[in-house]
């Protein structure tokens, strides 16, 4: 009956952690006689080569120094321990402590047994590194060129995260990698870039950072910090404005970041009716009149910039009836 | 502790047999297989072959096949070798040893010479 | 049947020497291979298994490198009580082989 030797083709650790590499003889074969189990790293140089034998008689042995016999040890396989007792070898599984990036490579557990010969197999043990993630906001203003509104940072990760990012925004990502602190890990940076506009501004998006070490990916929302000059409209204003009416008002409304730290209601004739009085972001009109036959000017500043608009009033000699809609205000 | 224990020289003529045996103590006899090499005067070793005793199961190497039998008595704790159609290039002396890891035990040997 | 071939056949060196003994398998054998020293009216003894770990009791002097189909084994330097005759032996494939033999002298 033919033995095989059953490995994982792939086995992945945490860095710094402990592994385990499972190696088993099958099928058990009364009269197979296991003499000597060896773990090698055929890919490592020729000094390095031999990682750990297991005699039947002496036990284990670890040639140093890498990984060497602190790091190193049979999790089943037992020695004789007397002249009633037999070695213990069809589990030859060798755990792997304190992992670090030199561990990772090809593995083969092979068995040297008799009458069968020797058989062996290969593991490919990866050394991974679960990565920590953040992700911030950049606080940048309004300009024309692409400038970066956001980062996500995947520190130390191996092998390096994936970063994404999940925006309806007009933007295009940047990524670097370095070496992180931990010899064998990447830190990734990967920004955010847009033109940043005031459309921008209180918009979230997110980070999608994919690593093998995770489940499922990391979704790190982040809202943008645009810092834009007051973008103005005017409302209030319903097309039903005559001599007489005392209701009506016009609205400053303003999108800014940061507030706005002013207002200023003017014509532009130059000529401010007395019966209209700015109060604010509103301009409250106690009586129209036809002065009010202008073009009404709100012009808002912030710590960036300034933004106006302007509303045209038309003055009926009458109330409009037909479609009157609501004033505002 | 393990001990493997031969019998006594023997002097055969061309085309007779030789059985040799090999007494094991000192360890479970079943568990474990007991192999024979032979060793010509002032030359190397050769594996002739192996029983293992916990099912009679031999092994043996191609060049000495169907002129060797090896077997294990398991109620004396002892394996035979017996070598048929002597000839002179068979002298030797023949040790038993136990495969621990490695040839770890051998008998003390025993000198089969073959002459007419 | 794999061929183990030793080299050289009789080795003659002085006490205190670095002496070395080479095995060459006419098939790879990986690293199962075994190194013994025999010494006259005796048994042989394992001085290294699986082709670079040295046998329990045995002096930090021998060394044994290798896979292969390339063996060496080492005597860091040589002791009058190392007289012998030194084997390499193959347990890949069966049957089980041995080389020639070297016969190591003291000049």
């Known amino acids: 009956q033919d033995v095989r030797v059953q490995v994982l083709p792939e086995v992945r650790g945490q860095l710094g952690g402990t592994v385990e590499l499972p190696c088993h003889l099958l099928p058990p074969v009364p009269g197979l006689y296991i003499s000597l189990v060896t773990w090698q790293r055929p890919d490592a140089p020729a000094n390095h080569q031999n990682v750990a034998a297991f005699h039947p008689k002496m036990g284990p042995s670890f040639p140093s120094p890498k990984p060497g016999s602190e790091r190193l040890s049979f999790v089943s396989a037992k020695q004789s321990t007397g002249q009633d007792t037999e070695a213990e070898l069809q589990d030859a599984t060798l755990a792997l402590h304190g992992l670090t990036v030199e561990d990772e490579g090809n593995y083969t557990c092979e068995f040297a047994t008799f009458p069968k010969g020797s058989v062996r197999g290969m593991t490919w043990l990866r050394v991974i590194a679960k990565p920590k993630n953040q992700a911030e906001a950049q606080k940048v203003t309004f300009s024309q060129d692409p400038t970066t509104v956001a980062l996500c940072i995947s520190k130390e990760g191996r092998p390096p995260a994936r970063i994404s990012w999940l925006s309806s925004l007009d933007w295009e990502a940047k990524e670097t990698q370095v070496s992180g602190t931990l010899a064998g890990t990447v830190t990734v940076t990967s920004r955010f870039t847009l033109v940043p506009s005031g459309r921008a501004d209180g918009v979230t998006v997110t980070c999608k950072v994919e690593h093998e070490s995770f489940e499922e990916p990391a979704l790190i929302p982040v809202t943008l910090s645009v810092r834009y000059p007051p973008e103005v409209s005017i409302s209030g204003y319903d097309d039903n404005w005559y001599l007489g009416r005392t209701d009506a008002t016009l609205s400053c409304d303003v999108r800014s970041n940061p507030e706005p730290t002013g207002y200023d209601w003017s014509t532009t004739s130059g000529t401010f009716p007395t019966s209209a009085v700015a109060q604010g972001s509103q301009l409250v009109i106690h009586a129209v009149d036809s002065l009010f036959n202008t073009t009404f000017v709100c012009t808002v500043t912030n710590a960036v910039g300034m933004g106006r608009a302007e509303q045209v009033i038309f003055v009926r000699e009458t109330p409009n009836t037909a479609g009157a809609g609501a004033t505002g205000g | 502790q393990v001990q493997l224990v031969q019998s006594g020289a023997e002097v055969k003529k061309p085309g007779s047999s030789v059985k040799v045996s090999c007494k094991a103590s000192g360890y479970i006899f079943t568990s474990y297989w007991i192999h024979w090499v032979r060793q010509p005067p002032g030359k190397g070793l050769e594996w002739i072959g192996a029983v293992y005793p916990g099912n009679s199961d031999s092994n043996y190497n191609q060049k000495f096949q169907g002129r060797v039998t090896i077997t294990a008595d398991e109620s004396t704790s002892t394996a035979y070798m017996e070598l048929s159609s002597l000839r002179s290039e068979d002298t030797a002396v023949y040790y038993c040893t136990k495969l621990v890891g490695t040839f770890d035990y051998w008998g003390q040997g025993t000198t089969v010479t073959v002459s007419s | 049947d794999i061929q183990m071939t030793q080299s050289p056949s009789t080795l003659s060196a002085s006490v205190g020497d670095r002496v070395t003994i080479t095995c060459r398998a006419s098939?790879?054998?990986?690293?199962?291979v075994v190194w013994y020293q025999q010494k006259p009216g005796q048994p042989p003894k394992t001085l290294i298994y699986?082709?670079?770990y040295r046998y329990s009791g045995v002096p930090d002097r021998f060394s044994g490198s290798g896979s292969g189909t390339d063996f060496t084994l080492t005597i860091s330097s040589l002791q009058a009580e190392d007289v012998a005759v030194y084997y390499c032996q193959q347990y890949n494939t069966n049957p089980f082989t041995f080389g020639q033999g070297t016969k190591l002298e003291i000049k």
């Open positions: 098939q790879n054998v990986g690293i199962n």
């Open positions: 699986s082709a670079s």
